[in-house]
């Protein structure tokens, strides 16, 4: 056979589906690799071919589209399982070809089992909700295309193992789960189970996501520098170690980059000819507010270093702040025999 453009194994698309549930998998060629869609390819006389390699096997084999009740079928650029079985796990390849053109890509499909409380090895998407913010909704994900709009499915929402059915602050509303107001106690895994009929059979789609309640933009403030501050003076003798912590609080802000940095005499530490090290640690509150600490360290400080300006800077989407540390050279304690005696007029 003639050469085929092989895009290899697309591990970016690690597709996980639940056992005994319908799954529709689009050929990734048209989504990520080719500049045209399936309709264009089809009308140009190209054919889409599917095959697979079972888990722990090397042999590529055709997909059996003649199973009872059309358990596996293909529709346009979609491979359908109605439903999946555990041993459908493997690497699937879709190939687009005619006599003069060929392009193919493979992707891994993992069929996973869940327990009665929806626990499974499935990687869960995380949905962040703002704390005490007002109405926010999450929508049952990845259910488009499974049934026509004329079919009205039933949707049941669970938090963890428990069906949500009381009128508390979290209310199921069809495909949506409405958080009238979100609290820390609403952190957890939420599952929607969509049940729909098809050709006399009943299918279930299970979708679980993790809700994380985070700081509200209503409460967000510019970075706050807790240290250095006006109450602490860093007094050192030459030869001692100088340690200055810069501790900054950042409100949670969606997609904001939090930055902390030191300047010495207005320059980045790397641009100053002194032996300085900076160590950073980061901690988070329950609502993902962030505290960053950068400790500036000079092992053996010189009298020259003690005259420099040390400024901690911080920046977030809310603004930029800076604070200088008060650094002084320690005045040596007087030696009694000479200095004090002189002070008392002794000769």
């Amino acid at each position: 056979s003639e050469r085929c453009d092989d895009w290899g194994l697309d591990t970016m698309r690690q597709i996980q589906v639940f056992e005994d549930e319908p799954a529709r998998i689009k050929c990734p060629l048209f989504e990520h690799f080719l500049k045209f869609n399936y309709s264009t390819a089809h009308s140009a006389g190209l054919t889409l071919i599917w095959y697979w390699t079972r888990q722990d096997r090397d042999l590529e084999e055709p997909i059996n589209f003649r199973l009872p009740e059309n358990r596996i079928s293909k529709e346009k650029d979609v491979l359908w399982f109605r439903p999946t079985l555990l041993n459908d796990t493997g690497n699937y390849t879709c190939m687009l070809r005619n006599t003069t053109y060929c392009s193919k890509v493979a992707f891994p499909l993992e069929v996973v089992q869940k327990d009665s409380c929806f626990n499974s090895p499935m990687k869960l998407p995380v949905h962040k909700l703002y704390i005490e913010y007002g109405i926010q909704r999450i929508t049952c994900p990845n259910v488009d295309g499974y049934f026509p709009s004329s079919v009205k499915p039933t949707i049941t929402w669970y938090m963890g193992c428990y069906k949500i059915q009381n009128f508390n602050n979290v209310i199921p509303e069809g495909m949506n789960l409405s958080f009238l107001i979100a609290f820390i106690s609403n952190n957890g895994n939420y599952t929607c189970v969509v049940t729909y009929p098809e050709n006399g059979r009943t299918f279930h789609l299970t979708r679980t996501l993790t809700v994380k309640v985070v700081g509200s933009p209503k409460n967000a403030v510019p970075p706050v520098i807790h240290s250095p501050n006006d109450h602490v003076v860093y007094e050192k003798e030459p030869g001692e170690e100088l340690l200055i912590p810069c501790t900054v609080y950042f409100s949670f802000l969606m997609d904001s980059r939090n930055e902390v940095w030191w300047t010495i005499d207005g320059k980045k530490p790397d641009d100053i000819p002194i032996d300085v090290t900076i160590n950073e640690s980061i901690s988070h509150s329950r609502t993902e507010d962030e505290t960053r600490t950068q400790i500036l360290s000079i092992k053996k400080v010189t009298s020259e270093d003690l005259k420099r300006s040390y400024v901690c800077h911080a920046r977030s989407a809310k603004g930029e702040v800076a604070k200088a540390a008060t650094v002084k050279q320690k005045v040596p304690a007087p030696r009694y025999t000479v200095e004090l005696a002189c002070g008392f007029g002794a000769t």
Epitope: Y133, G134, I135, R137, K152, T154, I155, T156, K163, Q165, N166, F167, N169, I171, E173, G174, N176, S178, L180, I181
Partner: antibody
């Protein structure tokens, strides 16, 4: 099509109870909540409470707490609203209405006039 | 006394534009979605707007909704005689317990 058909008008004496029914059809009964809203003659709309037909859980307006009971019968796709210790100011048209909490009340029954008079 | 405040009445001529306001607080309109209902004389209310500005199917685009801060507005353009009705805004409040709240209603009169 969605239909909510309510029981007929009632005349009650003060202190009595009334039970209004609302039969739903044209949709999956357990997929939507049912609200009860009343309207006194020449007045505005007043929310009384809500029932989840799926599990039967309810939430009542503070004003009616202890006097109102909402129930459902999934076998007949019917919800009921019972109001006890009736007083003359309970004279109103009582509506059952299908909907969610955050996205509006999309279908309303035709209303049931309850008259409380001695 | 309603939690949501609406003007008791508004009027305009056919073909004109009219707006109906609905004023609340941060505990209701400020944090939540607003719905609007039309009640023609002698009939049950009908949903016009939900989620502040969305129209159910079958509602003409002459009807629009908006929200700013703790107030909401219903707009009606190209006024028609059949628009003469009572209009109600609605939202909810949650303070450990759910409570659906309606405005007091606004009577729209189409002049002429």
């Amino acid at each position: 099509q969605v239909q909510l058909v309510q029981s007929g008008a009632e005349v009650k004496k003060p202190g009595a109870s009334v039970k209004v029914s609302c039969k739903a059809s044209g949709y999956t009964f357990t997929s939507y909540y049912m609200h009860w809203v009343r309207q006194a003659p020449g007045q505005g709309l007043e929310w009384m409470g809500i029932i989840n037909p799926s599990g039967g859980s309810t939430s009542y307006a503070q004003k009616f707490q202890g006097r109102v009971t909402m129930t459902r019968d999934t076998s007949t796709s019917t919800v009921y609203m019972e109001l006890s210790s009736l007083r003359s100011e309970d004279t109103a048209v009582y509506y059952c209405a299908r909907g969610f909490v955050t996205s509006g009340i999309d279908y309303w029954g035709q209303g049931t006039l309850v008259t409380v008079s001695s | 006394q309603s939690v949501l405040t609406q003007p008791p009445s508004v009027s305009a001529a056919p073909g004109q534009k009219v707006t109906i306001s609905c004023s609340g607080s941060s505990s209701n309109i400020g944090n939540n979605y607003v719905s609007w209902y039309q009640q023609l004389p002698g009939t049950a209310p009908k949903l016009l707007i939900y989620d502040n500005n969305k129209r159910p199917s079958g509602i003409p685009d002459r009807f629009s909704g908006s929200k700013s801060g703790t107030s909401a507005t219903l707009g009606i353009t190209g006024l028609q005689t059949e628009d003469e009705a009572d209009y109600y805004c609605q939202t909810w409040t949650y303070t450990g317990r759910l409570w659906i709240v309606f405005g007091g209603g606004t009577k729209l009169t189409v002049l002429g």
